[in-house]
């Protein structure tokens, strides 16, 4: 194995669960966001693949309430508005990293957990399986 | 005020640091992420508005490997393959929390992050500005 | 510079339904960044929540408790307001009025911008 | 709902003195979702902190927050005249779950 040197400065972790279980300063630091990413919010109704947000709520998570996108259409939107069902509205989904207590009630100690999201809808063309 | 006892079995706090400070367990728990994410990464290839993977990564953060999409036409895909500049192909962002190792090198010290993040793209109808 | 303009009357009678607007100027009453809020001060209750309208894709309503069978918040995107309706008003009800707007990131939950306040008085 | 408890109820400190308010919620809440106002006579509520330990736009650093869990505490490093007023933290714990202490007055003594 690789042999890192222990920085003079860094937390100990002479603990049992190392490296499971770290120190995490909660006080989040806002990385390339100066854009307010809800800018992007109105392409749920102009998309061609449109889609509604559906607030997932749970107060034991942090963020307690995720949006979550579902395609409006099996479909996709034609310029005359109407629905083409040779194209496929599909989600684009993400894995995020959520935190939740654990143990539960215990105010400090925390487990990371990744969920899978849906962020919007996009065109696809479809697979299409030919039988033999 | 309100006597609230502290929980047996939660981690001791007396840290200097403390309350900004947690424990966190990295032994992630997958919350209904059994179908693998990249499942859906044909998407970017049969989109209309298909997109390019470029890999983001930081070893001094987790997930140290962001996929990072970027659109690959200003305007969207048309049946025949031709690109249609009368709508547009937008990127979907998400804000995602991330850990930053914090003092930089330290291996069981992090930092929450947010970060801005481009999951796919769409086909949006553009905002026509009617000049007077 | 976002500002809250709250208008009304300040006497209503018992059993009446209290109407109270609040216009919005430097944001908009549909922003997906944004809840718009109601917010009451007493002597008695001190702060207390009563509701919210945010917009993401459709309009959501978050109705306090204590409230929840008497009060309607509706938004008017075309004057860019939203209003407090309460029903059935009884003297508790008499407080100072605040609209407010809620930063919602997920991340975030804040009041950062206030209405500057209607005192009202439920009395016959 | 959760009750977030206030104290001391009144403190009475001279100019240029250290003010430490505390927050106690009935169950743990986010941090992430803990404000603190202040609130001078015939005024709306003003954001100081939010996040648990984020200044607002505009506020002087001499204004700080911390806390996890249940305990939350403002601190005010070295009192101005400005800022004897009453001061209330605010909690979100979900959607229908939003509440505020009973607020702390800062006095002149």
């Known amino acids: 194995g690789i042999a890192i040197p222990r920085n003079s400065g860094c937390p100990n972790s002479e603990d049992k669960n190392f490296p499971r279980t770290v120190m995490v300063n909660l006080n989040i630091h806002n990385r390339n966001t100066s854009t307010n990413p809800k800018r992007s919010s109105d392409y749920y109704n102009r998309s061609t693949s449109p889609w509604n947000l559906h607030r997932n709520e749970d107060p034991e998570r942090y963020p307690s309430v995720i949006w979550e996108a579902k395609c409006r259409h099996l479909g996709c939107v034609k310029a005359d508005g109407n629905v083409d069902y040779h194209m496929n509205s599909v989600p684009i989904q993400q894995e995020i990293l959520v935190l939740r207590r654990e143990p539960r009630h215990c105010p400090n100690s925390f487990r990371l957990e990744k969920i899978l999201v849906s962020v919007g809808c996009t065109c696809v063309t479809p697979i299409v399986h030919h039988v033999a | 005020g309100i006597a609230i006892p502290r929980n047996s079995g939660c981690p001791n706090s007396e840290d200097k640091n403390f309350p900004r400070t947690v424990m966190v367990n990295l032994n992630i728990h997958n919350r209904n992420t059994s179908t693998n994410p990249k499942r859906s990464s044909d998407y970017y290839n049969r989109s209309t508005s298909p997109w390019n993977l470029h890999r983001n990564e930081d070893p001094e953060r987790y997930p140290s490997v962001i996929w990072e999409a970027k659109c690959r036409h200003l305007g969207c895909v048309k049946a025949d393959g031709n690109v249609d500049y009368h709508m547009n192909s937008v990127p979907i962002q998400q804000e995602i929390l991330v850990l930053r190792r914090e003092p930089r090198h330290c291996p069981n010290s992090f930092r929450l992050e947010k970060i801005l993040v481009s999951v796919g793209c769409t086909c949006v109808t553009p905002i026509v500005h009617h000049v007077a | 510079q976002v500002q809250l303009q709250q208008s009304g009357p300040g006497l209503v009678k018992p059993s009446q339904t209290l109407s109270l607007t609040c216009a919005i100027s430097?944001?908009?009453?549909?922003?997906?960044?944004?809840?718009w809020g109601w917010i009451r001060q007493s002597p008695s209750r001190g702060l207390e929540w009563l509701g919210r309208?945010?917009?993401?894709?459709?309009?959501?309503?978050d109705y306090a408790v204590s409230v929840k069978s008497r009060i309607t918040i509706n938004p008017d995107t075309s004057k860019n307001q939203f209003s407090l309706q309460l029903n059935s008003v009884t003297p508790e009800d008499t407080a100072v009025y605040y609209c407010?707007?809620?930063?919602?990131?997920?991340?975030?939950?804040?009041?950062?911008?206030w209405g500057q306040g209607t005192l009202v008085t439920v009395s016959s | 709902e959760i009750v977030l408890t206030q104290s001391p109820a009144t403190l009475s400190l001279s100019p240029g003195e250290r003010a430490t308010l505390s927050c106690r919620a009935s169950q743990n809440v986010w941090a992430f979702y803990l404000a603190w106002y202040q609130q001078k006579p015939g005024q709306a509520p003003r954001l100081l902190i939010y996040?648990?330990?984020n200044r607002a736009t505009g506020i002087p650093a001499r204004f700080s927050g911390s806390g996890s869990g249940t305990d939350f505490t403002l601190t005010i490093s070295s009192l101005e005249p400005e800022d004897f007023a009453v001061y209330y933290c605010q909690q979100y714990r979900s959607t229908l779950s939003l509440t505020f202490g009973q607020g702390t007055k800062v006095e002149i003594k």
């Open positions: 430097g944001d908009s009453v549909s922003s997906s960044s944004a809840a």
């Open positions: 309208i945010s917009y993401r894709s459709k309009w959501y309503n």
């Open positions: 407010a707007r809620e930063v919602d990131s997920i991340y975030y939950s804040y009041f950062d911008i």
């Open positions: 996040g648990a330990s």
